[in-house]
């Protein structure tokens, strides 16, 4: 029975050349988190494993930093970084929870964070 919910930073925007923190939080469950995967439109960016810590995909090593916590920091943003990002929580005994974040990378200096929202 999956009772948990994932709260994410929702729809967010950031400036080109800057950095942004992607955050998800799993709540309302006592399930044990085995691993958290971060993906960008079907590409694996990074893994945070409960036993082994962080693994950053080689093709993203220069621009992705682990943390804070189970979150992920994207650096040196380009317009091509605009799109959907997913946090995938592998838990036991519940199973797999998925959260979605949409990032828009702006040319301008006006980049406001969107409201937080929940995905059951």
């Amino acid at each position: 029975m999956m009772t948990g919910t994932i709260e994410t930073t929702g729809n967010i925007s950031a400036e080109k050349g800057g950095s942004i923190i992607l955050q998800c939080h799993l709540s309302s469950t006592t399930a044990q988190v085995t691993q958290v995967n971060w993906e960008q439109q079907d590409q694996l960016l990074a893994i945070c494993n409960a036993d082994l810590g962080w693994h950053i995909s080689p093709s993203f090593k220069d621009r992705v930093a682990p943390g804070p916590g189970l979150g992920l920091t994207l650096q040196s943003l380009t317009v091509n970084d605009t799109g959907e990002y997913f946090c995938i929580y592998h838990t036991y005994p519940d199973g797999t929870y998925t959260g979605r974040i949409f990032l828009e990378v702006l040319e301008s200096s006006v980049a406001e964070h969107g409201a937080r929202f929940q995905i059951p």
């Epitope: 044990q32 085995t34 079907d42 494993n49 409960a50 036993d51 592998h90 005994p93 199973g95 797999t96």
Partner: antibody, heavy 119, light 107 residues
Framework: EVQLVESGGGLVQPGGSLRLSCAAS????????MSWVRQAPGKGLEWVST????????YYADSVKGRFTISRDNSKNTLYLQMNSLRAEDTAVYYC????????????WGQGTLVTVSS | DIQMTQSPSSLSASVGDRITITCRAS??????LTWYQQKPGKAPKLLIY???KSHTGVPSRFSGSGSGTDFTLTISSLQPEDFATYYC?????????FGQGTKLEIK
């Protein structure tokens, strides 16, 4: 080349014990989640147990919980399944399997070892 | 537990045919569906994971699709080495359950 080689299967009486081993090579064993999956003769596949890379976390199917224990020795690149209080319905080919780093699927499997529980 | 139901249970086809195997989950499993191929006396081999992602080295004639509860594995042009049993498996929640298998035989 990834290789997984199971051993330790055989004929055992109901109530008996057996320890299966799976020798791994060709990859960084300690970095990967591993599982045991079984297949009764002429039947489908059944997930049995999973262990995290460091061995801290272990998960079991209800049908084997309290009877089977999964473990690993990362210094020996070996996965184990200790099977106690064996029943006739545990008769199956037991496969060890390596998960993708992403934990999305089991990408390599051993050839299997047959466990027969019979009096 | 999530029940996985494959159809058909067996299928006769010829080399060059296009075939589709269906897997239905008893509840929503998002895209957490894997397809394996197994030949008699051999271990299963990974074909497709995350519903549609091909594993390294899998021929392009194999493709997967679907999300939620309904999934399909398609072989676009059957080759002699494709005759085997195919299993789907859900990775949404424990226990990770398999379908009963679809046996693909030569007509």
């Amino acid at each position: 080349e990834v290789q997984l080689v199971e051993s330790g299967g055989g004929l055992v009486q109901p109530g008996g014990s057996l320890r299966l081993s799976c020798a791994a090579s060709g990859f960084t064993f300690s970095s990967y989640i591993m599982s045991w999956v079984r297949q009764a003769p002429g039947k489908g596949l059944e997930w049995v147990s999973t262990i995290s890379g460091g061995g801290t976390n272990t998960y079991y199917a209800d049908s084997v919980k309290g009877r089977f224990t999964i473990s690993r020795d990362n210094s020996k690149n070996t996965l184990y399944l200790q099977m106690n209080s064996l029943r006739a319905e545990d008769t199956a080919v037991y496969y060890c399997a390596k998960w993708l780093l992403s934990y999305y699927a089991m990408d390599y499997w051993g050839q299997g070892t047959l466990v027969t529980v019979s009096s | 537990d999530i029940q996985m139901t494959q159809s058909p249970s067996s299928l006769s086809a010829s080399v060059g045919d296009r075939i589709t195997i269906t897997c239905r989950a008893s509840q929503n499993i998002n895209v957490w569906l894997t397809w394996y191929q197994q030949k008699p006396g051999k271990a299963p081999k990974l074909l497709i994971y995350k519903a549609s992602k091909s594993h390294t080295g899998v021929p392009s004639r194999f493709s997967g699709s679907g999300s939620g509860t309904d999934f399909t594995l398609t072989i676009s042009s059957l080759q002699p080495e494709d005759f085997a049993t195919y299993y789907c498996q859900q990775g949404q929640s424990y226990p990770y359950t398999f379908g009963q298998g679809t046996k693909l035989e030569i007509k």
